[in-house]
């Protein structure tokens, strides 16, 4: 008789999840010599230990501590780029501007990027059928708690000027419920971070509005200012040109507003 299995609202664990995590770890540590000391089998064991045999709605940050310890990594604290709802452009930017880092450029972020995972209470099985959805099922699921944990640590490590890329095409350019709005903003350390600089990325070709005046951006400014961190904002009217100018800063067309 097949055992009854909890049906969740979200997609199940990504196909070949254990193999993918292990492969990404091997690749990352091979390419980034400063992480060469990491034992990928131990990393996978710690990752697995965070959610296997546990109820997928009852995961805590504590569950991920062994993994966090193994994945400890120093990135230049003044070169951090946060993002919200605009991951692809943020990653394209750090591919070109190698001196800056998103969370997904670190080992732990790289391991989990675009993956889904969960287990089942009291069995060592990975659930490939369904996993809890943050809204419809529960927020303390393995994926959400992982990103909350690594995002908090990433924000805590930041110093000097921190940049954040925001999606100007969305109704809420700054969303208090996003990982950036609910975790990272509140974990920037005022004693280390001088300024948060927001880059609002425009979607439409003809969109010349000053989205830095958007009410949600003003809300972000208020939250940041109350935390004794300065705030600045820039419109990126042409994201394609912006990337080109990062690649070729000496191009004559790059002196005008992007």
């Amino acid at each position: 008789v097949p055992r009854w299995r909890q049906q969740w609202s979200g997609p199940g664990t990504t196909k070949r999840f254990p193999e993918t995590v292990l492969a990404r770890c091997v690749k990352y540590t091979e390419i980034h010599p400063e992480m060469r000391h990491v034992d990928c089998q131990s990393v996978w064991d710690a990752f697995k230990g965070a959610f296997i045999s546990k109820h997928p709605c009852n995961i805590t940050e504590e569950d991920y501590q062994p993994l966090m310890k193994l994945g400890t990594q120093t990135v230049p604290c003044n070169k951090i780029l946060l993002w919200s709802r605009i991951k692809d452009l943020a990653h394209q930017f750090t591919q070109v501007q190698r001196d800056m880092f998103t969370l997904e450029d670190t080992l732990l972020g790289y391991l989990a990027d675009d993956l889904t995972w969960c287990g089942e209470f009291n069995t060592s099985k990975i659930n490939y059928q369904s996993c809890p959805d943050w809204r419809k099922d529960c927020s303390n699921n393995p994926v959400s708690v992982f990103w909350k944990t690594v995002s908090r640590r990433f924000a805590e490590a930041a110093c000097d000027v921190v940049h954040v890329m925001l999606n100007g095409s969305r109704s809420k350019i700054f969303d208090k419920n996003s990982t950036f709005g609910s975790v990272e903003v509140h974990n920037l350390q005022p004693e280390k971070v001088q300024t948060l600089e927001a880059w609002v990325i425009h979607g439409g070709r003809e969109d010349s509005r000053d989205l830095c005046q958007d009410p949600t951006i003003k809300e972000l400014e208020s939250i940041i200012s109350k935390r004794n961190i300065q705030f600045s904002c820039k419109n990126i009217y042409r994201p394609d040109k912006f990337l080109q100018c990062v690649k070729n800063p000496e191009d004559s067309s790059c002196t005008s507003e992007i």
């Epitope: 193999e19 993918t20 492969a23 690749k27 980034h32 010599p33 750090t94 591919q95 190698r98 450029d105």
Partner: antibody, heavy 119, light 106 residues
Framework: EVQLQQSGTVLARPGASVKMSCKAS????????MHWVKQRPGQDLEWIGG????????RYNQKFKDKAKLTAVTSTSTAYMELSSLTNEDSAVYYC????????????WGQGTLVTVSA | DIQMTQSPASLSASVGETVTITCRAS??????LAWYQQKQGKSPQLLVY???TLPDGVPSRFSGSGSGTQYSLKINSLQPEDFGTYYC????????FGGGTKLEIK
């Protein structure tokens, strides 16, 4: 703008050694792997090896382990490849090429250095 | 070492057609596969990495797919500038290239 400028055409005798250069600009030289690729006329691409200027880490294709030596001078952002005990089989275009952030593809290439081995 | 077998070795097609090039690895390369285009006398150009990701600036008519040991590159609505030689590359270990596919105008 990322640029990889390679040294010019080389004509060498069998048994000799040659050292070619690849001058990088437009990025932090010590933060990326520099790879070298061989292409014989009308033939396929072969990976020779890679060098990480940040800590002089080196990886070789076993086939080229005794043939090629990869080095770099970080102060001038220049990578070098020396080929020894040249034979006709070493006549080829040699490319230096830089990986992307996580080395998931060779995103930038030099223009190639043609090496001709002839008595 | 992992060997990469590319097929077909050559292919002729007309502008506007769709073509697919395949690449088989002798072992699992975990999606660490890149595709390049090379024109006569020029350096190769990166078209796809991580099996399916297009670098900034590569036209969307190019698409990569596959996993494990089987991968493919699809070019929709061929343009005159798409003709040349295409190579797959295993980025997982030892960076071995496939034998190339020469795409010619019919």
């Amino acid at each position: 703008e990322v640029q990889l400028q390679q040294s010019g055409t080389v004509l060498a005798r069998p048994g000799a050694s040659v050292k070619m250069s690849c001058k990088a600009s437009g990025y932090t030289f010590t933060r990326y792997w520099m790879h070298w690729v061989k292409q014989r006329p009308g033939q396929d691409l072969e990976w020779i090896g890679g060098f990480y200027p940040g800590n002089s880490d080196t990886r070789y294709n076993q086939k080229f382990k005794d043939k090629a030596k990869l080095t770099a001078v970080t102060s001038t952002s220049t990578a070098y490849m020396e080929l020894s005990s040249l034979t006709n089989e070493d006549s080829a275009v040699y490319y230096c090429t830089r990986g992307d952030r996580h080395d998931e593809g060779f995103a930038y290439w030099g223009q190639g250095t043609l090496v001709t081995v002839s008595a | 070492d992992i060997q990469m077998t590319q097929s077909p070795a050559s292919l002729s097609a007309s502008v506007g057609e769709t073509v697919t090039i395949t690449c088989r690895a002798s072992g699992n390369i975990h999606n660490y596969l890149a595709w390049y285009q090379q024109k006569q006398g020029k350096s190769p150009q990166l078209l796809v990495y991580n099996a399916k990701t297009l670098p900034d600036g590569v036209p969307s008519r190019f698409s990569g797919s596959g996993s494990g040991t089987q991968y493919s590159l699809k070019i929709n609505s061929l343009q005159p500038e798409d003709f040349g030689t295409y190579y797959c590359q295993n980025i997982w270990t030892n960076y071995t290239f496939g034998g190339g596919t020469k795409l010619e105008i019919k």
